[in-house]
């Protein structure tokens, strides 16, 4: 098809060589078209927009993406030729950065239902450059965490070294939906909830004497539980004595609850105390038996092939530890009578 009638948009992706980051292109079809594909919902400023940049068809996957080879060859279907690029509805996701992503990307409706649809297409000229500006050493990450229940903010990586006063007007999207009220280089969140998690895109316009282009950055935002302030607690054993039968096998289980930590290195081990001596026991590996957003319950067993008279004089100690501190629970074996 003839792409000369497509509206054109120039985008710049400046990626950091230090971090993994993604990029997206929206099939931002032009407004004036009369077709069902290119019609956009008009919203009063008070309404919260819940539309994707392209809001034409009921089935948002009815969009075809192409890349225009620089040598003038015919347009190539993105899905067939580029494994690192994923089409999700009307958004194109670039999974890996690199200057080889530079080029012209064209999107248009799959189904041409009226004469108006022929010119209903967008050509996006994407320029990809590695970040060379060393003056901004502490630019915001492309992966940002928000602490559930607290105040937080999401910074636009390409503008994070500029003060709010210097910053140009920014257009923000969350999961492809325009956030019309957000215009600064930082989104402030008064109280963080689960639904704040997602893919955020920040755009701003940069111009020189010849042309203007959109500088875009993508931020993956996770909502996380705050690191625990508590040492782990032992859920089992509860009692400090255990009735046993001599000569019989015995398994004692130690179950401990560890609170969330971003860097998680739990310790759970058994050791034996016998008068002045104590030593760690080689026991089966610890395993997680329950895993939730807030805590991890880990179990480790000590197995005695048969309980001996000597075992009755010993103390079996479960030791658990996280970055905050440690807890122990000791068990003394007692012979069952009768």
């Amino acid at each position: 098809f003839n792409i000369s009638g497509c509206s054109t948009k120039k985008l710049l992706w400046t990626y950091s060589t230090r971090s993994e980051e993604e990029f997206v292109l929206f099939c931002d079809l032009p407004e004036p078209q009369k077709s069902h594909f290119c019609h956009r919902n008009r919203l009063s400023p008070k309404q919260v927009p819940e539309h994707l940049p392209f809001m034409g068809s009921n089935d948002l996957s009815d969009v075809q993406w192409y890349q225009q080879p620089s040598n003038g060859d015919p347009l190539e279907d993105i899905r067939k030729s580029y494994p690192h690029i994923i089409q999700d509805k009307c958004t194109l996701h670039f999974l890996t950065p690199g200057v080889n992503n530079s080029g012209s990307y064209i999107c248009r409706p799959k189904m041409i239902k009226s004469p108006y649809d022929v010119a209903c297409c967008v050509k996006m000229i994407l320029e990809v450059k590695p970040q060379t500006n060393a003056s901004c050493e502490y630019s915001a990450s492309h992966k940002q965490d928000l602490l559930l229940g607290s105040t937080g903010s999401i910074s636009c990586p390409s503008l994070s070294c500029q003060s709010d006063a210097q910053s140009p007007a920014v257009t923000w999207y969350k999961n492809g939906k325009l956030l019309s009220v957000e215009r600064s280089n930082r989104i402030v969140v008064d109280e963080v909830y689960d639904y704040h998690q997602g893919t955020y895109v920040c755009d701003y316009t940069q111009s020189d004497t010849v042309s203007s282009w959109t500088v875009r950055a993508v931020v993956q935002v996770r909502t996380i539980v705050g690191d625990t302030k508590l040492k782990p607690d032992i859920l089992d054993p509860v009692e400090d004595t255990l009735e046993v039968e001599l000569g019989k096998p015995l398994t004692i289980s130690c179950k401990a609850r560890f609170g969330f930590e971003r860097v998680f290195n739990p310790v759970i081990k058994w050791y034996i105390k016998d008068s002045d001596l104590e030593w760690e026991v080689s026991v089966p590996e610890a395993k997680s038996i329950k895993s939730t957003l807030k805590d991890e319950i880990i179990e480790r067993n000590i197995i005695l092939e048969k309980v001996t008279q000597r075992d009755l004089r010993r103390k079996f100690v479960c030791f658990v530890q996280n970055s905050i501190g440690n807890t122990t629970q000791s068990v003394q074996l007692k012979e069952k009578r009768g």
Epitope: P266, S288, T292, I298
Partner: nanobody, 116 residues
Framework: EVQLVESGGGLVQPGGSLRLSCAAS????????MGWFRQAPGKERERVAS???????TYADSVEGRFTISQDNAKNTLYLQMNSLRPEDTAVYYC??????????WGQGTLVTVSS
């Protein structure tokens, strides 16, 4: 530092077999679940199979009866035995560990190509 490293990917003919391995290091315990995921060109990442600490397993419908997940705790290794491979199984395969209610620890992936 916890780390997962996949290996065993490669080019195989339709109907052939491959065995993927995932070496886990830095873990002080066995996670509640370990899983294999895959991402085919132009598609979203999908869960292929997962295994619990009690050795119970679950599989995606598309691989049920053809793929087998297993783990060797002594070697800290997770496996995916893939038989009767089809062209549609072509993807990058990722190993993942479940921590605090989600698959949070990921390997870098290994490419499996099924083609004649």
């Amino acid at each position: 530092e916890v780390q997962l490293v996949e290996s065993g990917g490669g080019l195989v003919q339709p109907g052939g077999s491959l065995r993927l391995s995932c070496a886990a290091s830095g873990f002080t315990y066995i996670p509640a679940y370990m899983g294999w995921f895959r991402q085919a060109p132009g598609k979203e990442r999908e869960r292929v199979a997962s295994i619990k600490t009690d050795a119970s397993t679950t599989y995606a419908d598309s691989v049920e009866g053809r793929f087998t997940i297993s783990q060797d705790n002594a070697k800290n290794t997770l496996y995916l035995q893939m038989n009767s491979l089809r062209p549609e199984d072509t993807a990058v395969y990722y190993c993942a560990a479940y921590q605090f209610g989600a698959f949070r620890v990921w390997g870098q992936g290994t490419l499996v190509t099924v083609s004649s």
